[in-house]
Amino acid sequence: RAPRCRELPAQKWWHTGALYRIGDLQAFQGHGSGNLAGLKGRLDYLSSLKVKGLVLGPLHKNQKDDVAQTDLLQIDPNFGSKEDFDNLLQSAKKKSIRVILDLTPNYRGENLWFSTQVDSVATKVKDALEFWLQAGVDGFQVRDIENLKDASSFLAEWENITKGFSEDRLLIAGTNSSDLQQIVSLLESNKDLLLTSSYLSDSSFTGEHTKSLVTQYLNATGNRWCSWSLSQAGLLTSFLPAQLLRLYQLMLFTLPGTPVFSYGDEIGLKAAALPGQPVEAPVMLWDESSFPDIPGAVSANMTVKGQSEDPGSLLSLFRQLSDQRSKERSLLHGDFHTFSSGPGLFSYIRHWDQNERFLVVLNFGDVGLSAGLQASDLPASASLPTKADLVLSTQPGREEGSPLELERLKLEPHEGLLLRFPYVA
């Protein structure tokens, strides 16, 4: 008799794929044209990335450091009107993209929560949550919560309002902290909070260190749902050496939890790589005309257009990974086991019941390495086969779908492999 199927866990929409942050509407859309109406026209692009949620804004009226000219219920006219926002929500819904609104109050100022009394601001945030939930948003993000006195209790109140409206709504909190104890204490009083932090960026970017960071985080947070990113707002290129970008995309998409990216991560957009750009919000490179001020400053392989036409580009890798992440049970909610492999490597398995299983092998080193996979520390339910099929490599030159012998597996410098193999009873 066939073994009984394992009961599927409850899946919220943010469990099913990546979130995509657009913190600066104008920079995302390109020079001087950034508003909500224009963003509507980019939803097809977001669909092509297979992201599940768009983390948008802040969009509210905020005069730098001025409480008396900050209104969480009013959209800054530079971004458009409430009607434009409602239209965006409707269009996003039709494309199954959820919209999460950033409500960080003083986003144009020094201290994102103002350097004054937090109580009155926190009370206003509660009213804003209610207002925007009724307007149809799917969740909220608040950043720099380390600057909030009594952050845990405020977050608990805000989460109550968000979840009280619907269990299907999400609260994301961001912190600059990379301290695990601090992160865990923020998570403790908020059962469904997603927390983005600088935890993973506090790394020496070696396989061993990354493995230990990931396992410590998962152990400390228990069986709660995690999110994975390198910061609460920044681009991957701001934290990673260029040669590790592909590796990290593969890792973020295959760890257990929700991957969170910033606009431009999918093309390797660099902060301030071009003259005159603000560091925190570089202009999205849609095509070679995205930066008209300096002719020739943008080459095709830096742009969405150019990378869309190149199957070996970072954008193509992102799309492939996002597709796998959103449809494979083992990647959606599978168990996670790390195991020993060669020095400089980080390897793990994702598996769910009798579904296809996935093996991820990441070489963080500057030299080619033999994988040296040792399955002895894996539980019986997650044993390794002798061969696995290649889903993708972060480097060119390997044939997708080809079977690879795991005992003889070698990786190029900075190469990551995603392999699949069937469940065997």
Epitope: V67, A68, D71, T116, Q117, D119, T123, K126, D127, F165
Partner: antibody
């Protein structure tokens, strides 16, 4: 023009109940939080209760907690204050006031008030 | 709760005078201080919010200042229509609390 008009005041016996109303016009009522503030004869102003635009967030002064209930009917642009177990010290002019949407909290518009007298 | 104190309960001044009314909070209220005017007929209006911001339609002869726990309202050129009671109020924390009021009369 923002307009707030209170009604429902009058003479009530101690231990009795009363419901005050505040009719709002000239603004999108459901967007704004609303307060009740009172003023006893020859005394200062005292904040009584607050309700957010969608009725999710409600707060009361300790002196009325458990006895007064603030509510609103957004389609009818009306704010209410249901008062029970009334005491002589609840005798006052009752004002409804609108809360600004700015982070700099304040009562930006007030009604003209309705007088409640609690006496036997 | 934060206590708000207006030490002067009544004040006499002549038309054209510069009048200052003060208000003290029992703890730092970080500029979340508002001033209201109550006319003899009971009508209440917001004059100044967040220490020094003039509410729309309020004449520019009204101004506010202060920080921390100490705040003041100034009428630079007293007019007949300014005869009223003035209340300060903190918006820093719940419950919102008011000062006892300062009644302004003409000499």
């Amino acid at each position: 023009d923002v307009q707030l008009v209170e009604s429902g005041g009058g003479l009530v016996q101690p231990g009795g109940s009363r419901k005050l109303s505040c009719a709002a016009s000239g603004f999108t009522f459901s967007t704004f939080g609303m307060h009740w503030v009172r003023q006893a004869p020859e005394k200062g102003l005292e904040w009584v209760a607050y309700i957010s635009g969608g009725s999710t967030n409600i707060y009361y002064a300790d002196t009325v907690k458990g006895r007064f209930t603030i509510s609103r009917d957004n389609p009818k642009n009306t704010l209410f204050l249901q008062m029970t177990s009334l005491r002589s010290e609840d005798t006052a002019m009752y004002y409804c006031a609108r809360e600004t949407t700015l982070l700099a909290t304040n009562f930006d518009y007030w009604g003209q008030g309705t007088t409640l007298t609690v006496s036997s | 709760d934060i206590q708000m104190t207006q030490t002067t309960s009544s004040l006499s001044a002549s038309l054209g005078d510069r009048v200052t009314i003060s208000c003290r909070a029992s703890q730092d209220i970080s500029n979340y201080l508002n001033w209201y005017q109550q006319k003899p007929d009971g009508t209440v209006k917001l004059l100044i919010y967040y220490t020094s911001r003039l509410h729309s339609g309020v004449p520019s002869r009204f101004s506010g200042s202060g920080s921390g726990t100490d705040y003041s309202l100034t009428i630079s050129n007293l007019e007949q229509e300014d005869i009223a009671t003035y209340f300060c109020q903190q918006g820093s924390t719940l419950p919102r609390t008011f000062g006892g009021g300062t009644k302004l009369e003409i000499k």
